[in-house]
């Protein structure tokens, strides 16, 4: 009923941008974007007691205010400030799990290990996960046809700036031991150009964060290499050490068993290396 009230109150009509308007290289706004964001907000605030007082209508107003009527290649972090503020969330700062190029496993892990949090376990990350959105300069329309691609069009687009902003704040809030899950199957296990490598690494606060612990997830069944010795991991260690944060690394040789052992830590087979 909360959602119905919100839509009845404003009777928003979201028109598609006509096809003859500027075509971007990326996919357009996710269909039913306003409804999806509001529905997710209502669901999240119902489930998470610490966010129950959040007004989802205000959250949506702040979200749309960040990109509606603005050129989709000229979005700034400042545009998202009201949304970031309304989505302020106190997560246990020593229970943060960052990830790079291995989102699904990270999310499977926090679904089992309920006291740890990825960005997508917070309100703002949950609202935007897997969605695309953009508007158009000087019109109140949402562009459902196409949105700027980060590489082919511009980096300061609504989606990229959102994730950069929210990732920075998430990293800034971390403390003690921070974990990061990295994909050992990729040519660059640590990629300086990923959100983790370009934003989160540089916004961990050395006065609060003692250690960054990397979990390198192996892909092949028979892969017994020590991927913690990979040159890109050494590069990550160097960046972190220069920031006066300690670094440690663990190989997760069998991610399936790893998840199983998180679910059932008493299992006798879980004492050996995973």
């Amino acid at each position: 009923s909360g959602l119905n009230d919100i839509f009845e109150a404003q009777k928003i009509e979201w028109h598609e941008v006509p096809r003859w308007r500027q075509q971007w290289s990326g996919p357009g706004t996710t269909k039913r974007f306003p409804e999806t964001v509001l529905a997710r907000c209502v669901k999240y605030t119902e489930i998470h007691p610490e966010m129950r007082h959040v007004d989802c209508q205000s959250v949506w107003d702040a979200f749309k205010g960040a990109f509606i009527s603005k050129h989709p290649c000229n979005i700034t972090e400042e545009d998202y400030q009201p949304l970031m503020k309304l989505g302020t969330q106190t997560v246990p700062c020593n229970k943060i799990l960052l990830w790079s190029r291995i989102k699904d496993l990270a999310h499977q892990f926090t679904q089992v290990q309920r006291d740890m949090f990825t960005l997508e376990d917070t309100l703002l990350g949950y609202l935007a996960d897997d969605l695309t959105w953009c508007g158009e300069f000087n019109t109140s329309k949402i562009n459902y046809q196409s949105c700027p691609d980060w590489r082919k069009d511009c980096s300061n687009n609504p989606v990229s700036v959102f994730w950069k902003t929210v990732s920075r704040r998430f990293a800034e809030a971390a403390c003690d031991v921070v974990h990061v899950m990295l994909n050992g199957s990729r040519s660059k296990i640590f990629d300086k150009n990923s959100t983790f490598g370009s934003v989160e690494v540089h916004n961990l606060q050395p006065e609060k964060v003692q250690t960054l612990e990397a979990w390198v997830i192996h892909g092949g069944r028979e892969d017994s290499r020590d991927l913690c010795q990979d040159p890109t991991i050494k590069e990550l260690e160097s960046i972190i050490s220069k920031r006066n944060i300690q670094f440690s690394c663990k190989n997760i040789y069998r991610p399936d068993k790893f998840l199983q052992c998180v679910k059932n830590p008493e299992d006798s087979s879980c004492t050996s290396e995973i």
Partner: antibody, heavy 123, light 110 residues
Framework: EVQLLESGGGLVQPGGSLRLSCAAS????????IIWIRQAPGKGLEWVAA?????????YYADWAKGRFTVSKDNSKNTVYLQMNSLRAEDTAVYYC???????????????WGQGTLVTVSS | DIQLTQSPSTLSASVGDRVTITCRSS????????LAWYQQKPGKAPKLLMY???NLASGVPSRFSGSGSGTEFTLTISSVQPDDFATYYC??????????FGGGTKVEIK
Amino acid sequence: EVQLLESGGGLVQPGGSLRLSCAASGFSFNNYWIIWIRQAPGKGLEWVAAIYSPSGDIKYYADWAKGRFTVSKDNSKNTVYLQMNSLRAEDTAVYYCARELSGSSYEGYFESWGQGTLVTVSS
Amino acid sequence: DIQLTQSPSTLSASVGDRVTITCRSSQSVYGHNWLAWYQQKPGKAPKLLMYRASNLASGVPSRFSGSGSGTEFTLTISSVQPDDFATYYCQGYYSGASYAFGGGTKVEIK
């Protein structure tokens, strides 16, 4: 110089309404959150409502203020308002408007305050 | 509801004394350190002293310092001056951008 000036306080009967104003000067009004905070006589501070208007109004309230209190803004007059309805004796307080520090590293703190306006709810 | 508890509620001190005020929050503040301290004198609005637990606001003398994280914070005046006799409030910032203030600590002349 940053200045915030509240007005509109006074004596009102229980169940009555009052509209407070907060006139701002000396800064770019649209770029800051303005927060209403109150202080009952001899008591501590309590936040009431917040508003920010970069394009449209974005506002939110303390749980206890939802439904009775409404915050709004007139950008042409550089003024924020607090409409208070169904007033009770326990709403008697000095009402301050304050400007929040700007920038994500500083949000959540109040760097500039008005002098306050006293609201007395009594029959 | 979030509770911020300050202790003591009143504190008597002499000029030159070292004074410490404690603030405890019923929930962890945002970012583990999103807590401010204000000074208020009778009939005046509060004045920001410290933000993010340990950062001195502009123009505040260095005899003021803050520390703590999570739920426990302290404000210290290393050597109380005549101008410091006032009431001090802590203020936390929490999920959903909500704010809470402590009940205040009055620092009076012994």
